[in-house]
């Protein structure tokens, strides 16, 4: 008799990451009978919603449903119809919406309300849309990468199934860079976390973890650039800003009203004698780096040690996965290799920033000019943030692993968020039944 394949007993989950610059929808899949095993959930699809982040729809909230349609339709196509009604959908909004909420709680609520109504129209099990805290964003990113790296598994292996695995159970730290905020999360070595706001306690798979996390609002790459421009225009003698963070020959007109639109530039706001100014790139890494450092206040620290702006940061410990924009920017700059030292990265950035804008445009013809123009700033900002902000050194640089995906799943907070909300990370180590790891029935 012919062997007949048993129907796949799988489950699906959907998480929408509503970031400051864009929204991405992730579809996850796992075997139903292995829900509590570590490492069984994997990403089957990412759909990047075309357009900006949801906070940009504040003046046209009625269009949020249109904006989300294509990716929600994609989810309907990917997930079997029989599974639709039991597939949970979660939307988490991050720093872009945190900033909108700071400006107007009413407007932020209105955006989320329309998002909820739009997502409720689909045949899935919609579980809600909310603005997650910076602490959650950091924690879930840390859970995601350690789950995917197999760090929560008690079974030690003599072989490595994932990159970066050192066959020990020491967790990786998580470094996440978005457009509007950046998170640092790790388990410090026998160090008390001096500020309670930065301390998290987890019990996962029978093991206790004391985790440090902090989210720096306004220090994502896009908001950091707005901050830098607002700071530098204060001392400009006229409406021309000669900017070392842009390539020589680059020119762009900026509206002062756009510059002061975000809460992140409030501390630099002043009455200027012009409505617009022109950025003129001069492409100098060292000067750009110096300008960025002025965004980090390191003169005040009420703890044994700080990152910047008086925020406690314990001594760095172990390996770190740097993902989201840390990865995208460094990948574009071809600097993600484990073999590239910090000195080499700095050298490459000096050369890249000094390249004329016309040359850059020709070399990267397929890249949107808005993004292309900002890689010099973003790369320099990443170096400044990691070295001066978080106190990585030339030696500890080799402990930073720029990670896009781990085993086919994107590194980021969404997987950890879903694992938590679906109760798929047990506090205790599940008892292994004889069949739970069997490959046949």
């Amino acid at each position: 008799t012919q062997n007949k394949a048993l129907p796949e007993n799988v489950k699906y989950g959907i998480v929408l990451d509503a970031g400051s610059s864009h929204t991405s929808l992730y579809i996850y899949k796992w075997p139903a009978e292995k829900e509590n095993d570590t490492g069984v959930v994997h990403q089957v699809e990412e759909c990047r919603v075309k357009g900006p982040g949801i906070s940009k729809f504040v003046q046209k909230v009625n269009e949020i449903g249109i904006y989300l349609t294509d990716c929600m339709e994609r989810a309907r196509e990917v997930i079997p119809r029989s599974q639709h009604q039991e597939t949970p959908v979660y939307l988490g909004a991050t720093a872009g919406m945190r900033l909108l909420r700071m400006e107007s709680e009413e407007l932020a609520d209105r955006v989320l309300d329309v998002v909820e109504r739009s997502l409720s129209n689909y045949p899935f099990d919609f579980q809600g849309a909310r603005i997650i805290t910076g602490q959650e964003e950091g924690a879930y990113g840390w859970i995601t990468i350690n789950y995917l790296l197999g760090k929560f598994s008690q079974k030690t292996r003599w072989f490595s199934i994932v990159p970066y695995e050192t066959n020990n159970q020491e967790t990786f730290g998580a470094l996440d860079l978005g457009g509007a905020s950046t998170q640092v999360t790790f388990v410090p070595q026998n160090q008390t976390i001096e500020s309670p706001d930065n301390a998290l306690q987890f019990r996962l798979y029978g093991k206790d973890y004391n985790v440090y996390t902090h989210s720096f609002l306004c220090y994502g790459k896009d908001q950091a650039l707005w901050q830098k421009l607002a700071k530098d225009i204060q001392v400009a003698s006229n409406e021309i800003l000669r900017d070392p963070c842009f390539h020589p020959g680059y020119k762009k007109v900026v509206n002062v009203s756009d510059l002061y639109k975000t809460p992140c530039t409030k501390r630099f706001e002043m009455t200027l004698p012009f409505q617009q100014f022109e950025i003129q790139g001069i492409g100098n890494y060292q000067q750009c780096h110096q300008s960025i450092l002025e965004l980090f206040n390191t003169s005040y620290c009420p703890y044994s040690q700080c990152a910047f702006n008086g925020i406690f940061l314990p001594p760095l410990q172990g390996d770190f996965g740097a993902f989201s924009a840390f990865y995208f920017v460094m990948k574009f700059l071809n600097l993600t290799s484990e073999k590239v030292s910090q000195e080499k990265v700095t050298e490459m950035m000096k050369k890249f920033c000094a390249q004329p804008w016309e040359e850059i445009k020709t070399s990267y013809a397929g890249v949107k000019e808005k993004y292309l123009s900002e890689y010099c700033f973003s790369g320099t900002y990443i170096l400044s943030l990691l070295l001066q902000g978080y106190h990585f050194t030339a030696d500890s640089w080799e402990h930073i692993h720029f990670i896009g995906k781990i085993q086919g799943s994107d590194a980021g907070w969404t997987l950890g968020y879903m694992l938590n909300l679906t109760n798929m990370i047990p506090a205790e180590q599940p008892l292994s039944t004889p069949l739970s790891h069997s490959t046949y029935v």
Epitope: C47, R48, K50, G51, P52, K56, F57, Q59, K60, E63, G65, I66, Y67, T69, D70, M72, R74, R117, S118, N121, Y122, G366, V367, K368, E369, K370, Y371
Partner: antibody
Framework: QVQLLQSGAEVVKPGATVKISCKVS????????VHWVRQRPERGLEWIGK????????KFDPKFQGRLTITADTSTDTAYLELSSLRSEDTAVYYC??????????????WGQGTLLTVSS | DIVLTQSPATLSLSPGQRATISCRAS??????????MNWFQQKPGQPPRLLIY???NQGSGIPARFSGSGSGTDFTLNIHPLESEDFAVYYC?????????FGPGTKLEIK
């Protein structure tokens, strides 16, 4: 500014295959969908299909099944429409178009100038 | 396929007047709380131009005299007051399901 430049007019014989290109400048095609629409002489508009260049998912009118291929090259921001087993009723002006939300949540549309395809023996 | 019917086929009006063009779908083009109906304008020798998307939203740079309304199967494009550059052919298009179909068009001509 955004421009869509299509390849030049084509005169082909029935049964042949044609490949029309649509080169986009000032915009990254990964950030939107590329649609193809045609207009036969003295007739209305006819939607052919679309591609998401970010993941190469395509959707098209089933009546073109088996003879239509829509592709995109994100490195050059160029989309392509390939139509095979051509017949006289495929004679039309073929347009590529982008529509969707920009970075400021404005809904845009950009069109190519059109490519005239003539199928004649 | 969803079939769209437009009326009238031709409309003769003078500048300053109101133009009302109707589009009826063979089945509802509503889904997920959205009406997937778009309106395009086309002038001779030119590509089309998107006027209205999702039944009632104006495309970028479209003058306020163009407005769209309707839901389900019945939709309307209004132009008021008509200007000389508005005389053209107008098409409705549904984007609820593949194949996205266009209506046969309405020719708006100067009286």
């Amino acid at each position: 500014q955004v421009q869509l430049l299509q390849s030049g007019a084509e005169v082909v014989k029935p049964g042949a295959t044609v490949k029309i290109s649509c080169k986009v400048s000032g915009f990254s095609i990964k950030d939107t969908y590329v649609h193809w629409v045609r207009q036969r002489p003295e007739r209305g508009l006819e939607w052919i299909g679309k591609i998401d260049p970010a993941n190469v998912n395509t959707k098209f009118d089933p009546k073109f099944q088996g003879r239509l291929t829509i592709t995109a090259d994100t490195s050059t921001d160029t989309a392509y429409l390939e139509l095979s087993s051509l017949r006289s009723e495929d004679t039309a002006v073929y347009y590529c178009a982008l529509y969707g939300y920009d970075d400021d949540a404005y809904y845009f549309d950009y069109w190519g100038q059109g490519t005239l395809l003539t199928v004649s023996s | 396929d969803i079939v769209l019917t437009q009326s009238p086929a031709t409309l003769s009006l003078s500048p300053g007047q109101r133009a009302t063009i109707s589009c009826r779908a063979s089945e509802s083009v509503d889904n997920y709380g959205i009406s997937f109906m778009n309106w395009f304008q086309q002038k001779p020798g030119q590509p089309p131009r998107l006027l209205i998307y999702a039944a009632s939203n104006q495309g970028s740079g479209i003058p306020a005299r163009f407005s769209g309304s309707g839901s389900g199967t019945d939709f309307t494009l209004n132009i008021h007051p008509l200007e000389s550059e508005d005389f053209a052919v107008y098409y409705c298009q549904q984007s609820k399901e593949v194949p996205y179909t266009f209506g046969p068009g309405t020719k708006l001509e100067i009286k």
